[in-house]
């Protein structure tokens, strides 16, 4: 028998630094977790022990705090180049700046393979990134060889910005035939690393023949074998056992998100390449196991520039940007109207002719605007001013939703009016009218949406049997404020871009704005 | 197929410059960086420096850094590396070399260099 | 700056022989390493990279290992049209060399 160490990480989304519990930003030093100094030390330290041992990552390094906006993907190439990752799969956030933002910072850089075999480029872009990534590699790992074969979320076109000219296939039609030529080449021992989340994962582990393991990433699944160490609940066991079409237990497993653990898999192969067992968790990268020195110092001299770019001007507010929450909690506010304006800006795609975009509709909670913004400091916005009304590091995710959950939505938005509390939603795309005199769970009496099936947009009554595409914090997505019907009843949930990061560059973009009140949300009495 | 096509051999002067050339084909010429190395006659080999033809971005052995200069010519897919006042120990063969993970795949030929008064 | 240390500088070895050269750098370099085959004449060729991955098409005789500072490249059974000098690469901090190994045919 043979065994092989898998170490994985997925959906990092940024977090270069260590973080507090919750992977936002660090507060109490000795209660930090993450981070890649923290990552390197476990992880040298697991190479040292054991023999045979691959860094895997799957995908979604991009995106998610300050490092991302300034150094646009640099920073990811150099530290995972430190920490001698030995593969990455593409994950959909790999795109949000774009084919060149990918090819530039990070494929010209890498001094590992990416990996993806379900994106095709087609047209001039063929030639351009021919070889910078590729379907798979196979890796000598002791003296036995590993096939590793990528795959990526077919969603990337509406969650990020490949272009026209990649074709994101179906994984499991593009992953078969890879995997098949690796078997030609004598490689009896594959990896299946990619970014579609744990439902794909779980269906890729069924249904390709030839894949022993499935390390997978988007969905922030966390799998744990036995009581789990911090706030995370495991969603299934650590590895996650699924029986292939061909009678084959395949192991899959996933590593939550933000560097917070260090995926940990052992599998033992018999000598035909069949998986014989398989073990392991997540390690939690807590304090106990102290930041790597010269990795610590790097990404202290990284730093500089990010505390410069946080006071430098991204555009200019003609107008007070009111995120009190004398406003924001009690009825329509401007500032509400930017973030909603930007997130739905952030999201065109068009992708399809018969649509003028995707999504069209916004929902924020008023509790997660900590801020407002005075327009008498020469009108400058800058990061900083940003950082305040929205401190919490959370990302503005797609959602897919029926009319009824909605609707269900904008009920409790005003179940307790009148409290001052977060649960008040701004919108964007929407048009609602609350009758406050009705008895709770009864107060809205009109509920019109965006088209996005339109040439012209204009606004409908929402259909409670249909289902709507929604940009919601990742907050609301996972239940906060009480929106429970939107975590039980979400049809889909893609997460998002980091929200400062989504405000920043609507701004930036605008250079000069100035949202208005003007009449998204509505009270009335009597009748309609 | 990629492949680096270099110019033909040059004889110079103590104190004067050169400028070889390195044509790519066969791949996206600003997708990749290019290196430059020499090796003199009977030694090893010995990095020059390397630039990212897309951007024009170059990092520098420190030996060379104040006489060899790196450019590109997008539109004819040509790298170029000038040395300027050369001396006897800078006879040499040149060579491109395309970088991929980090290191080099795909060699040009070779020019060599030649130093003489 | 990052030294490289390659010996022998030169070695001799019967057909089937089993041939290692060893590099050794000045501090960690994380196994980003190359060894290059340099016949008379020609331009280098691209052997292996991060230290015992094969380029597409390398026969499997050659084979690279190690890690830290230590490196070692192999070739299990000599043949005739593997009489060449070779040379490692450090690419973890900028480049660095090896000063070459001349393999001959005893």
């Known amino acids: 028998a043979w065994e092989l160490t898998i170490l994985h990480t997925n959906d990092v989304h940024s977090r270069l630094e260590q973080t507090s519990e919750d992977s936002s930003k660090c507060v109490n030093a000795s209660r930090c977790m993450g981070g890649v100094a923290r990552l390197f030390t476990k992880v040298q330290q697991i190479r040292r022990a054991e023999p045979n041992v691959l860094l895997l990552d799957a995908g979604d390094q991009y995106q998610g705090t300050i490092w991302f906006t300034v150094y646009k993907g640099a920073e990811v190439a150099h530290f995972m180049n430190a920490l001698r990752y030995d593969a990455m799969a593409l994950g959909n956030h790999e795109f949000d700046n774009g084919v060149e933002g990918l090819i530039e910072p990070l494929l010209k850089e890498a001094k590992f393979p990416i990996l993806s075999a379900n994106i095709k480029a087609k047209g001039p872009l063929a030639s351009q990134i021919s070889g910078l990534y590729l379907p798979y590699k196979v890796l000598p790992v002791g003296d036995e060889v590993v096939g590793i074969v990528g795959y990526t979320s077919k969603e990337t076109p509406f969650l990020s910005n490949p272009g026209t000219n990649l074709v994101f296939e179906d994984e499991i039609t593009a992953l078969q035939p890879e995997v098949d030529k690796l078997k030609t080449l004598n490689v009896n021992k594959i990896i299946a690393l990619g970014h579609s989340g744990f439902e794909m994962d779980k269906l890729i582990a069924q249904k390709v023949r030839g894949v022993d393991v499935v390390v997978g990433g988007h969905s922030n699944t966390f799998l744990y074998t036995g009581n789990p160490p911090s706030k995370e609940v495991p969603a299934g066991k650590y590895p996650f056992i699924v029986t292939s079409d061909d009678g084959r237990k395949v192991p899959v497993v996933q590593a939550y998100a933000f560097g917070k653990y260090l995926g940990y898999l052992k599998i033992e192969f018999d000598e035909r390449g069949n998986v014989i067992s398989s073990h392991g968790n997540p390690i939690l990268l807590n304090s106990s196991i102290p930041e790597d020195p010269s990795i610590k110092a790097d990404i202290n001299k990284w730093r500089i520039k990010l505390d410069n770019y946080s006071t430098q001007e991204l555009g200019k507010t003609i107008v007070y940007l009111d995120g009190s929450s004398q406003s924001c909690r009690f009825r329509e506010c401007n500032m509400g109207n930017l973030i909603c304006d930007a997130m739905i800006n952030n999201n065109l795609r068009h992708t399809d002719e018969m649509f003028w975009n995707h999504v069209s509709m916004c929902i924020l909670n008023g509790g997660g605007i900590r801020s407002p913004i005075d327009e008498r400091n020469n009108g400058t916005i800058t990061w900083e001013n940003l950082a305040a009304v929205l401190p919490f590091g959370g990302t503005f995710d797609l959602v897919q939703l029926k009319g009824s959950t909605l609707k269900k939505a904008f009920e409790h938005s005003v179940h307790r009016y009148g409290q001052s509390t977060g649960e008040f939603l701004q919108v964007g795309g929407i048009h609602v009218v609350y009758d406050l005199s009705r008895k709770p769970g009864d107060r809205v009496v009109k509920l019109d949406v965006l088209c996005t099936k339109c040439r012209v947009p204009s606004y409908d009554p929402l259909k409670m049997d249909e289902v709507y595409k929604v940009i919601l914090p990742n907050f609301l997505a996972n239940g906060g404020d009480g929106f429970q019907m939107i975590k039980d009843e979400l049809l889909r949930h893609d997460s998002g871009d980091q929200d400062i990061n989504v405000v920043s560059t609507y701004i930036s973009k605008m250079k000069v704005i100035y949202p208005a009140v003007e009449g998204r949300i509505k009270f009335s009495t009597g009748s309609h | 197929q990629v492949q680096l096509v270099q110019s033909g051999a040059e004889v110079k002067k103590p104190g004067a410059s050169v400028k070889v050339s390195c044509k790519a084909s066969?791949?996206?010429?600003?997708?990749?960086?290019m290196h430059w190395v020499r090796q003199a006659p009977g030694q090893g080999l010995e990095w020059i420096g390397e630039?990212?033809?897309?951007?024009?971005?170059?990092n520098y052995n420190e030996k060379f850094k104040s006489r060899a200069t790196l450019t590109v010519d997008k539109s004819t897919s040509t790298a170029y590396m000038e040395l300027s006042s050369l001396r006897s120990e800078d006879t040499a063969v040149y060579y491109c070399a395309r970088r991929v993970y980090g290191t080099m795949d795909y060699w040009g030929q070779g020019t060599l260099v030649t130093v003489s008064s | 700056d990052i030294q490289m240390t390659q010996s022998p500088s030169s070695l001799s070895a019967s057909v089937g022989d089993r041939v290692t050269i060893t590099c050794k750098a000045s501090?960690?370099?994380?196994?980003?390493l190359s060894w290059f085959q340099q016949k008379p004449g020609k331009s280098p060729k691209t052997l292996i990279y991060r230290a015992n991955i094969w380029v597409d098409g390398v026969p499997s005789r050659f084979s690279g290992s190690g890690s830290g500072q230590d490196y070692t490249f192999t070739i299990s059974s000599l043949q005739p049209e593997d009489i060449a000098t070779y040379y490692c690469l450090q690419y973890d901090e900028l480049y660095t060399f090896g000063q070459g190994t001349k393999v001959e045919i005893k």
């Open positions: 630039i990212n033809p897309s951007i024009g971005r170059t």
């Open positions: 501090q960690d370099i994380n196994s980003y």
């Open positions: 066969g791949y996206t010429f600003t997708s990749y960086w």
